[in-house]
Amino acid sequence: EEELQVIQPDKSVLVAAGETATLRCTATSLIPVGPIQWFRGAGPGRELIYNQKEGHFPRVTTVSDLTKRNNMDFSIRIGNITPADAGTYYCVKFRKGSPDDVEFKSGAGTELSVRAKPS
């Protein structure tokens, strides 16, 4: 079995302020079992945007039904985009761990740019 890869096909996306951003991410394997998380930025100061396993993320919806059998699409939509949302977003696969899940592999990132609303 080939090792899982996290594919973020869009290097960048441009969204108008007030609109919804779609950030695409797919995994290439069902193995290992474990959730996906989305972050803005990299390194220790990265900001958690969405966690499949737990948490409340009112601006974020998933494109696919995560409970769908054999789902490997972890794309998200972020609503009501503002200039403060600009940055590089990473889709990160975790593998099931005990007691905590362990980061396994990250996508290459998608840069979100925000176009100001015309005044």
Partner: antibody, heavy 119, light 110 residues
């Protein structure tokens, strides 16, 4: 971490119904399937049914389709399994189990609820 | 429905020796390159514990003396060097369609 806490032991008369609960914590309840499995004394495991808490989609073992009903309460992250028209051979430990990979498997288990059916 | 048949029903193995449990499906449990077989360990008075998923992948925290193999209809759980704490009943389960379990194999120390 993931925890599934089940309701206490029950003693029921033949012909009665029982409703077993399974309270989930440590994860987003609506993102993962819940399975129900039973085990009669000294016997093997028997899959009853599964439910997707996000939309209440259910799949039943044909053997239980007419007597078992699965429900969830997303406000309390609790899953329920009701079994009707109880018979003595329904005496068993009833387990709930969470499917962490949408593979129709059982990654995390409750401790079980003993249901005794006796006149 | 796919029926899973485990063999043997019971097995006694010396400490440090290899234990092998088989699981045969009545039809293929493979789909899209994956083998939908899972192995569980159950000790007395406890719920089952997932050991192996998708035929050959060790679950988190499971010692690497456990391994799974096979494809199509024939699958094997192997414990390379039996430890006292491995005494339990072992079950295979498929999810090619709706889940079913094998009847279980009781593993004891010789």
């Amino acid at each position: 971490q993931v925890q599934l806490v089940q309701s206490g032991a029950e003693v029921k008369k033949p012909g009665a119904s029982v409703k077993v609960s399974c309270k989930a914590s440590g994860y987003t309840f609506t993102n993962y399937w819940i399975n129900w499995v039973r085990q009669a004394p000294g016997q093997g495991l028997e899959w009853i049914a599964m439910i997707d808490p996000s939309d209440s989609e259910t799949h039943y073992n044909q053997i239980f389709k007419d007597r078992a009903t699965l429900t969830t309460d997303t406000s309390t992250s609790t899953a329920y399994m009701e079994l009707r028209s109880l018979r003595s051979d329904d005496t068993a430990v009833y387990y709930c189990a969470m499917d962490y990979g949408s593979l129709y498997a059982m990654d995390y288990w409750g401790r079980g609820t003993l249901v005794t059916v006796s006149s | 429905d796919i029926v899973l048949t485990q063999s043997p029903d019971s097995l006694a193995v010396s400490l440090g020796e290899r234990a092998t449990i088989n699981c045969r499906a009545s039809k293929s449990v493979s789909s899209s390159g994956y083998n939908y077989i899972f192995w569980y360990q159950q000790k007395p008075g406890q719920p089952p514990k997932l050991l192996i998923y998708l035929a050959s992948n060790l679950d988190s925290g499971v010692p690497d003396r456990f391994s799974g193999s096979g494809s199509g209809t024939d699958f094997t759980l192997t414990i390379s060097s039996l430890q006292a704490e491995d005494v339990a009943v072992y079950y295979c389960q498929h999810s090619r369609d709706l889940p079913t379990f094998g009847q279980g194999t009781k593993l004891e120390i010789k």
